[in-house]
């Protein structure tokens, strides 16, 4: 008789999840000399221990603490790039500007990027059929709690000028319900962070509006100012040209506004 299994509203664990995490860990440690000593089997064991045999709607940040400790990594605190709803461009940017880091450029972020996972209460099985959806099922699911935990730690580590890339094509350029809006903004440390600089990325070719005047950006400025952190904002009218100028800053066309 097949055992009854909880059906969740979200997609199940990414296929070959354990192998993917382990392979990503090995690859990361080979590429980043400062992390070359990391024992990826221990990292996977800690990752697995955070959600296996636990109810996937009852995961806590404490469940991830062993993994957080094993994945401790020092990134230059003044070279942090946050992003919201514009991950691909943020990652393209840090691939060119190698001294800046998104969360997904760290070991733990790299391990989990674009993956889904969950277990089942009281069994050692990984659930490949379905996992809880943040809205329809529960917010304390393994994936959401993981990203909340690593995002909080990443924001807490930031110092000096912190940059954030925001998507100017969305109705809410700054969304209080995004990970950036609900976690990272509130965990920047005013005693360490001097300025949050927002880069608003324009979508349309002919879009010459000053999106830094958008009401949601003003809302972000208000939140940040109340936390005793300065705020600045720049329009990136041409993201393609922006990336090109990061690659080739000497290019004569890069002196004009991008």
């Amino acid at each position: 008789v097949p055992r009854w299994r909880q059906q969740w509203s979200g997609p199940g664990t990414t296929k070959r999840f354990p192998e993917t995490v382990l392979a990503r860990c090995v690859k990361y440690t080979e590429i980043h000399p400062e992390m070359r000593h990391v024992d990826c089997q221990s990292v996977w064991d800690a990752f697995k221990g955070a959600f296996i045999s636990k109810h996937p709607c009852n995961i806590t940040e404490e469940d991830y603490q062993p993994l957080m400790k094993l994945g401790t990594q020092t990134v230059p605190c003044n070279k942090i790039l946050l992003w919201s709803r514009i991950k691909d461009l943020a990652h393209q940017f840090t691939q060119v500007q190698r001294d800046m880091f998104t969360l997904e450029d760290t070991l733990l972020g790299y391990l989990a990027d674009d993956l889904t996972w969950c277990g089942e209460f009281n069994t050692s099985k990984i659930n490949y059929q379905s996992c809880p959806d943040w809205r329809k099922d529960c917010s304390n699911n393994p994936v959401s709690v993981f990203w909340k935990t690593v995002s909080r730690r990443f924001a807490e580590a930031a110092c000096d000028v912190v940059h954030v890339m925001l998507n100017g094509s969305r109705s809410k350029i700054f969304d209080k319900n995004s990970t950036f809006g609900s976690v990272e903004v509130h965990n920047l440390q005013p005693e360490k962070v001097q300025t949050l600089e927002a880069w608003v990325i324009h979508g349309g070719r002919e879009d010459s509006r000053d999106l830094c005047q958008d009401p949601t950006i003003k809302e972000l400025e208000s939140i940040i100012s109340k936390r005793n952190i300065q705020f600045s904002c720049k329009n990136i009218y041409r993201p393609d040209k922006f990336l090109q100028c990061v690659k080739n800053p000497e290019d004569s066309s890069c002196t004009s506004e991008i």
């Epitope: 000399p33 400062e34 070359r36 000593h37 990391v38 024992d39 089997q41 221990s42 990292v43 062993p66 400790k69 094993l70 994945g71 401790t72 990594q73 020092t74």
Partner: antibody, heavy 117, light 110 residues
Framework: QVQLQQWGAGLLKPSETLSLTCAVY????????WSWIRQPPGKGLEWIGE???????NYNPSLKSRVTISVDTSKNQFSLKLSSVTAADTAVYYC???????????WGQGTMVTVSS | QSVVTQPPSVSAAPGQKVTISCSGS????????VSWYQHLPGTAPKLLIY???NRPSGIPDRFSGSKSGTSATLGITGLQTGDEANYYC???????????FGGGTKLTVL
């Protein structure tokens, strides 16, 4: 067969600078980290610091203010300088290669360095 | 005082088995690979175990390594008088950005 050959002054006075060099023979120099490790008489092994072929270094925090490790890729050599030595720096000093398997797989023969007035 | 601790000494009779422990924390053994070395007086240390439990070629299978959490163990079976030496564990420490050695364990074959 990779071999490490090391040399340098064996007797120093307090406040002088210890200087040792390690040459890599019979194998690749790039792609590895190269360490200095010491063992004071009757004590255990102590890691001093490391360097790779591009000159990137890490040092033992307790020695960092006095240590400089440098590299000469044209000669496949790396060197240790330890300034302001005292009797506590008396030890056998080893150079070693950190292999691809997160361990010291090849060691130099060791150099006894004595600090005495 | 080493951040990674080993018993100062262990002893056993020829043919017996002995284990040497190495205890650390999350920032060293917990998250990084452990290696083991045999050090005979007047010679350079010799690698016995790398990546927690692997032997380099030429090291007999009497020597084994394991790791669990923040501790590692070196096992030696079929003890021989030639095994008398000092044994060291080593691992990277993420917090220190450097290697750390255990204090060393003197093995006496009775």
């Amino acid at each position: 067969q990779v071999q490490l050959q090391q040399w340098g002054a064996g007797l120093l006075k307090p406040s002088e600078t210890l200087s040792l060099t390690c040459a890599v023979y019979g194998g690749s120099f790039s792609g590895y980290y190269w360490s200095w490790i010491r063992q004071p008489p009757g004590k255990g092994l102590e890691w001093i610091g490391e360097i790779n072929h591009s000159g990137s270094t890490n040092y033992n925090p307790s020695l960092k203010s006095r240590v400089t490790i440098s590299v000469d890729t044209s000669k496949n050599q790396f060197s240790l300088k330890l300034s302001s030595v005292t009797a506590a720096d008396t030890a056998v000093y080893y150079c070693a290669r950190e292999g691809l398997r997160h361990s010291f797989d090849i060691w130099g023969q060791g150099t006894m360095v004595t600090v005495s007035s | 005082q080493s951040v990674v601790t080993q018993p100062p000494s262990v002893s056993a009779a020829p043919g017996q088995k002995v284990t040497i422990s190495c205890s650390g924390s999350n920032s060293n053994i917990g998250s990084n690979y452990v290696s083991w070395y045999q050090h005979l007086p007047g010679t350079a240390p010799k690698l016995l175990i790398y990546d927690n439990n692997n032997r380099p070629s030429g090291i007999p299978d009497r020597f084994s390594g394991s790791k669990s959490g923040t501790s590692a163990t070196l096992g030696i079976t079929g003890l021989q008088t030639g095994d008398e030496a000092n044994y060291y564990c080593a691992t990277w420490d993420t917090s220190l950005s450097g290697w750390v050695f255990g204090g060393g364990t003197k093995l006496t074959v009775l």
